[in-house]
Interface confidence: low
């Protein structure tokens, strides 16, 4: 049978050729008739046999980690019969571990990302070296990690690679640490090979800044015409931390005026001092209030970083603006008797400049001929006044600062013209009445009722009468009926168209009025021709009729 | 270079109080925290407590919380130090020094110091 | 008594090295960062190392600090006359909220 033993060969051998081993079968005796043969892949090439002895070389330098083993096949042949001594068999070649390779990190580049105040202890990442050297062959491929640069903020466990925070790191004075990792083969002893990585450790925030003011006071002004809304100026705290945990609010903590209010640009981070209330120079000059700022989002854990919230001082100074004159009254009503003479009081009005100079004032009226005012303010007519041609006026009156004539205010003054009885009651319209010839006694002619253009105090009550001259002689007679009308009739029985065509009556009206006012009204009746039904028949005016309505045969 | 330098020495009676300043010039006064360290005659140095300038955020060590008063003025880069109802064993040179960003990092400058002897 | 423990005096002759050492908790040393000041007689204090082991301009580099968990250490190395100072070890200390200082180690360099 075949004689062997395990054969190895050393990696890497820098010799021609290197003796592997030898191959023989018991049947040979040394004197040279058998012969060996070589066979499979790299035989011939990499390995070569002596056909005489069985001795095998490697004539190649090998590579273990690109090949570790070759199986060939082995015969044996008399050479002087040609005849298969042994039967072919099959053999194993394998390349023996030299420490060759050095650790590498393939899962480069390494990045880790850790919370800034994390405890000693925390795990950061894990760098895993690989080494294409043998495992099992003795401590070539036995890595143990190191920490070239890093400390003392972090750790590598040297089995492992696991690196770990061996000192409390902030993110706000330094984010970002490059950690370089070392790994060594035959754990660390004379001889081993090394390899080298870089992590890149960033620190993500937490919140362990609260805001904190850049001022310990601001000083803000305000124009006392600004309207409320208005924002006056911003005040700005900082924070070391970054994104969320920036995020800031501001409020007011004192304000004793409740004159103020912040609110929080959340995008610039600033707070907004605003108006809540209008101001006023001349009532508060300046104002102090205290504002504070807190994070937006703190996590309960964080809260020692938070107990106080940081304050500021703001001293807010209002800016006097010349403002105009400001009338006691938004508007004034007088009252005045029409018919009283020119140059009569009417009322006075009166304005302030409210800024504290105290501006002398000046008065005018815009477009009235009838009225006056002087710089004190009193309104006067300038002529008599007709309750019946204008029973209001509408003034404006301008209050101008003597100092600065562009500060103008003005109001709308009513001068109500009050009623003198200086009216007596009229006809309400013009009467022209008929009577026939054969009319009898108490007979309705007309109807008439009266007007009086004065305002009435309480209600109108006319009062109607004929003349005196025409009470003692007249055809006609009058009754007031207590409603403001009366009624003409006839006093006698029987009329002449010939004789006496037409009648002027005389009616006195008059008024309640103090003193009673009368006026003569005259009342025309014209006497026309009727037949015994009452038609009229001829009246000496032929239009009166048609315009009576009467037809004429 | 930093330089941080305190008010003169003071005697005061026991029961009244006194007020160190330190004035700070050459950094960003409003950037960095202030500590104020006392050292008694003889014996070693003692923290009392620490004042952010901008905001004037204070934390006082336990021992003299309700006694003790830290106040800043930007205007001025000056921080004050101001400890009540004094008591013999007050007696000290009083330390204001440097801190940093955070409240935990180390102080690199420190005045020259202030003595307070209170006797009656 | 001091929450951060320091022994109150070291000695060593010129030339020798010596280790201060202070030891705290967790709240303290364990979470934060150690500082170490010297006191020259009659001086201010100066900061010596910050951050456990890092030395301000000026400061030689015979003076080093270190820390391991709740306890932290300063040594110094070739000792001169001009090291006779008190040393003290200050933190910030997580549960008082507030800094804490060792009670100081008188260095005596001696001969």
């Known amino acids: 049978g075949w004689v062997w033993n395990q054969f190895f060969v050393p990696e890497e051998m820098n010799t021609t050729s290197h003796h592997v081993g030898r191959l023989r079968s018991d049947l040979d005796n040394g004197n040279n008739s058998f012969q060996y043969k070589l066979l499979g892949a790299g035989a011939g090439s990499t390995f070569i046999i002596d056909e005489r002895t069985g001795d095998i070389y490697a004539i190649e330098k090998l590579d273990r980690e690109e090949r570790s083993l070759y199986i060939l096949r082995a015969q044996v042949i008399d050479i002087t019969t040609g005849r298969a001594v042994e039967p072919e068999s099959e053999f194993v070649i394998k390349v023996s571990d030299i420490n060759d390779n050095e650790p590498k990190f393939l899962d480069e580049p390494y990045e880790a990302i850790v919370p800034e105040m994390s405890p000693e202890g925390t795990l950061v990442i894990q760098v895993t070296a690989s080494d294409a050297d043998d495992p099992s062959s003795g401590n070539n491929a036995r890595l143990l990690y190191s920490l070239l640069q890093g400390q003392p903020y972090f750790s590598v466990e040297p089995t492992t690679g696991v690196i770990r925070i061996s000192s409390k790191m902030d993110r706000e004075l330094q984010d970002e640490y490059w950690v370089i990792i070392q790994a060594k083969d035959m754990i660390g002893q004379p001889g081993a090979l090394s390899g080298t990585t870089s992590v890149l450790i960033k620190l993500s925030d937490v919140n362990d800044n609260k805001p904190i003011f850049k001022e310990s006071l601001y000083r803000l002004t305000v124009s006392e015409s600004a309207p409320t809304g208005t924002s006056i100026g911003t005040i700005m705290a900082y924070d070391n931390d970054i994104g969320e945990n920036a995020e800031m609010d501001y409020s007011i903590e004192e304000d004793d005026s409740q004159t103020f209010d912040i609110i929080t640009n959340h995008e610039t981070q600033e707070g907004i001092v605003i108006l809540k209330k209008k101001v006023n120079f001349e009532h508060q000059n300046h104002y102090g209030i205290r504002a504070k700022v807190k994070n937006h989002h703190v996590d309960e854990q964080l809260m020692k970083y938070h107990t106080e919230a940081s304050t500021t001082f703001i001293k807010i100074q209002v800016e006097d603006v010349d403002e105009p004159p400001l009338f006691l009254l938004p508007y004034y009503i007088f009252e005045i008797f029409e018919e009283t003479p020119q140059g009569s009081f009417v009322g006075v009005v009166s304005a302030t400049d409210p800024d504290n100079r105290k501006s002398p004032i000046r008065y005018s009226i815009t477009r009235s001929k009838v009225f006056n005012i002087d710089d004190n303010g009193t309104i006067t007519t300038t002529n008599s006044l007709d309750r019946e041609i204008s029973a209001w006026y509408n003034l404006s009156i301008t209050a101008t600062e003597k100092y600065n004539i562009e500060q103008i205010s003005s109001i709308p003054v009513y001068v109500q013209v009050l009623n003198i009885n200086d009216h007596a009651p009229e006809f309400s319209q013009y009467y022209e009445s008929y009577v026939c010839e054969n009319a009898g006694s108490g007979q309705v002619i007309q109807t008439i009722s009266a007007v009086d253009r004065d305002e009435s105090i309480e209600e109108h009550h006319f009062y109607f009468n004929l003349s005196v001259e025409d009470t003692n002689s007249s055809s006609f007679t009058i009754i007031d009926n207590q409603d403001n009308t009366a009624v003409i009739l006839t006093n006698r029985t029987g009329f002449n168209l010939q004789e006496e065509p037409i009648f002027y009556i005389s009616i006195l009206i008059a008024d309640n009025g103090i003193p009673s006012l009368t006026s003569t009204n005259t009342l025309t009746i014209h006497v026309c021709d009727c037949d015994d039904s009452g038609s009229t028949q001829t009246c000496q005016y032929q239009e009166l009729m048609l315009s009576m309505g009467f037809k004429t045969e | 270079q930093v330089q941080l330098v305190q008010s003169g020495a003071e005697v005061k009676k026991p029961g009244a109080s006194v007020k160190v300043s330190c004035k700070a010039s050459?950094?960003?006064?409003?950037?960095?925290?202030m500590s104020w360290v006392r050292q008694a005659p003889g014996q070693g140095l003692e923290w009392m407590g620490i004042i952010h300038p901008s905001g004037g955020d204070t934390t006082y060590a336990q021992k003299f919380q309700g006694r003790v008063t830290m106040t800043g003025d930007t205007s001025t880069s000056t921080v004050y130090m101001e400890l009540s109802s004094l008591r013999s064993e007050d007696t000290a040179v009083y330390y204001c020094?440097?801190?940093?960003?955070?409240?935990?990092?180390?102080?690199?400058?420190w005045g020259q110091g202030t003595l307070v002897t209170v006797s009656s | 008594h001091s929450v951060l423990t320091q022994s109150p005096s070291a000695s060593g002759t010129p030339g020798q090295r010596v280790t201060i050492s202070c030891s705290g908790s967790?709240?303290?040393?364990?979470?934060?960062?150690v500082n170490w000041y010297q006191q020259l007689p009659g001086t201010a204090p100066k900061l010596l190392i910050y951050?456990?082991?890092q030395r301000p301009s000026g400061v030689p580099d015979r003076f080093s600090g270190s820390k391991s968990g709740t306890s932290a250490s300063l040594a110094i190395s070739g000792l001169q006359s001009e090291d006779e100072a008190d040393y003290y070890c200050?933190?910030?200390?997580?549960?008082?909220?507030?800094?804490?200082f060792g009670g100081g180690t008188k260095l005596t360099v001696l001969g």
């Open positions: 020094a440097r801190g940093g960003i955070k409240l935990w990092l180390h102080f690199d400058y």
């Open positions: 050459r950094y960003t006064f409003t950037s960095y925290y």
């Open positions: 951050t456990n082991n």
């Open positions: 967790r709240s303290n040393i364990g979470s934060n960062f």
């Open positions: 200050a933190v910030w200390d997580d549960s008082l909220n507030g800094w804490v």
